[in-house]
């Protein structure tokens, strides 16, 4: 059975957009005007995982690229990466756990918690032009709140 997906962009709570930084990294920075076209468009797929009224499991692929955000241990630390997959097999309803994020809606803001590493979140730095990363703290210096903008297919 086909997986349900939608196209969207994400901005952090400081309105920084996400753009590619090299082939396997995202960074967050403020964009304006025509530069907004640089921001990555995600194909957000609704996948197997823990689901409730305010929590929906999703996978975040880059639209029309065979790249997905995934969470893995690197040097014993949960780490966010862009992982290349076989486009014949992805997306699928039952993604490997490292690709799954719990999309949590709180006060019209979104958090993306790793299913593989509970209490670790997609995060951005306060500073401009820094990598998007997996952070283990909420409510501190780093930003874990996002807004989503729908993009027509």
């Amino acid at each position: 059975a086909p997986v349900r997906s939608l196209n969207c962009t994400l901005r952090d709570s400081q309105q920084k957009s996400l753009v590619m930084s090299g082939p396997y990294e995202l960074k967050a920075l403020h964009l304006q005007g025509q530069d907004m076209e640089q921001q990555v468009v995600f194909s957000m797929s609704f996948v197997q995982g823990e689901e409730s009224n305010d929590k929906i499991p999703v996978a975040l692929g880059l639209k029309e690229k065979n790249l997905y955000l995934s969470c893995v241990l690197k040097d014993d630390k949960p780490t966010l990466q862009l992982e290349s997959v076989d486009p014949k097999n992805y997306p699928k309803k039952k993604m490997e756990k490292r690709f799954v994020f719990n999309k949590i809606e709180i006060n019209n803001k979104l958090e993306f918690e790793s299913a593989q590493f509970p209490n670790w979140y997609i995060s951005t730095s306060q500073a401009e032009n820094m990598p998007v990363f997996l952070g283990g703290t909420k409510g501190g210096q780093d930003i874990t709140d996002f807004t989503m903008q729908f993009v027509s297919s």
């Epitope: 059975a1 197997q48 995982g49 823990e50 689901e51 699928k92 039952k94 756990k97």
Partner: antibody, heavy 119, light 106 residues
């Protein structure tokens, strides 16, 4: 309370087609996947396949050439057809619901129907 | 298609802790589920998404999943826990069950 009630022929001859139907009572029909699983006597469970309300299916490759799962949303029912049965298809057949709240796994099961294939 | 391997049988004394394992290639990168089946009855989901309990399942049932092994743990095992237990995961978009473990409460 969700209930799955299943029925169908219990005794078949080799080469005949197995047909089972499962009716769903209580809860929404369109928000779930609907599955069939079988269990040969004294053995383990084998997943046969699943369907959603729109009729989109996913089958176990080992049975795919012989299996059809269909849905009748107007009656909240789904059905299993298995063609060209042999003695190896003798099993208890279960229908089940796969729910998003339990991670798309099988949280409600029918009572099971023993299907015996014998000449 | 991957294989999920369970021990055929596990024995435990009442009040003790029973552990049933399920092994499979990179199983920890998938979600694991556990079912209990008593003779003549349909299976019942006891653990979903590695470690979550459906409503109505006692707290003595818990689960974990990492590496190549998922484990169902029953603490303070009771006579009524005697049953067959099946692990389940998915592989290549199909559901796969382990061969089952018969839990005997001595």
């Amino acid at each position: 309370q969700v209930q799955l009630q299943q029925w169908g022929a219990g005794l078949l001859k080799p080469s005949e087609t197995l047909s089972l139907t499962c009716a769903v009572y209580g809860g929404s029909f369109s928000d779930y996947y609907w599955s069939w699983i079988r269990q040969p006597p004294g053995k383990g469970l084998e997943w046969i396949g699943e369907i959603d309300h729109s009729g989109s299916t996913n089958y176990n490759p080992s049975l795919k050439s012989r299996v059809t799962i269909s849905v009748d949303t107007s009656r909240n029912q789904f059905s299993l057809s298995l063609s060209s049965v042999t003695a190896a298809d003798t099993a208890v057949y279960y229908c089940a619901r796969a729910s998003p709240s339990s991670g798309w796994t099988l949280d409600y099961w029918g009572q099971g129907t023993l299907v015996t294939v014998s000449s | 298609q991957s294989v999920l391997t369970q021990p055929p049988s596990v024995s435990v004394s009442p009040g003790q802790t029973a552990s049933i394992t399920c092994s499979g290639d990179k199983l920890g990168d998938k979600f694991a589920f556990w079912y209990q089946q008593k003779p003549g009855q349909s299976p019942v989901l006891v653990i979903y998404l590695d470690n979550k309990r459906p409503s109505g399942i006692p707290e003595r049932f818990s689960g974990s999943n990492s590496g190549n092994t998922a484990t169902l743990t029953i603490s303070g095992t009771q006579a009524l826990d005697e049953a067959d237990y099946y692990c389940q995961a998915w592989d290549s978009n199909i559901e796969v069950f382990g061969g089952g473990t018969k839990l005997t409460v001595l």
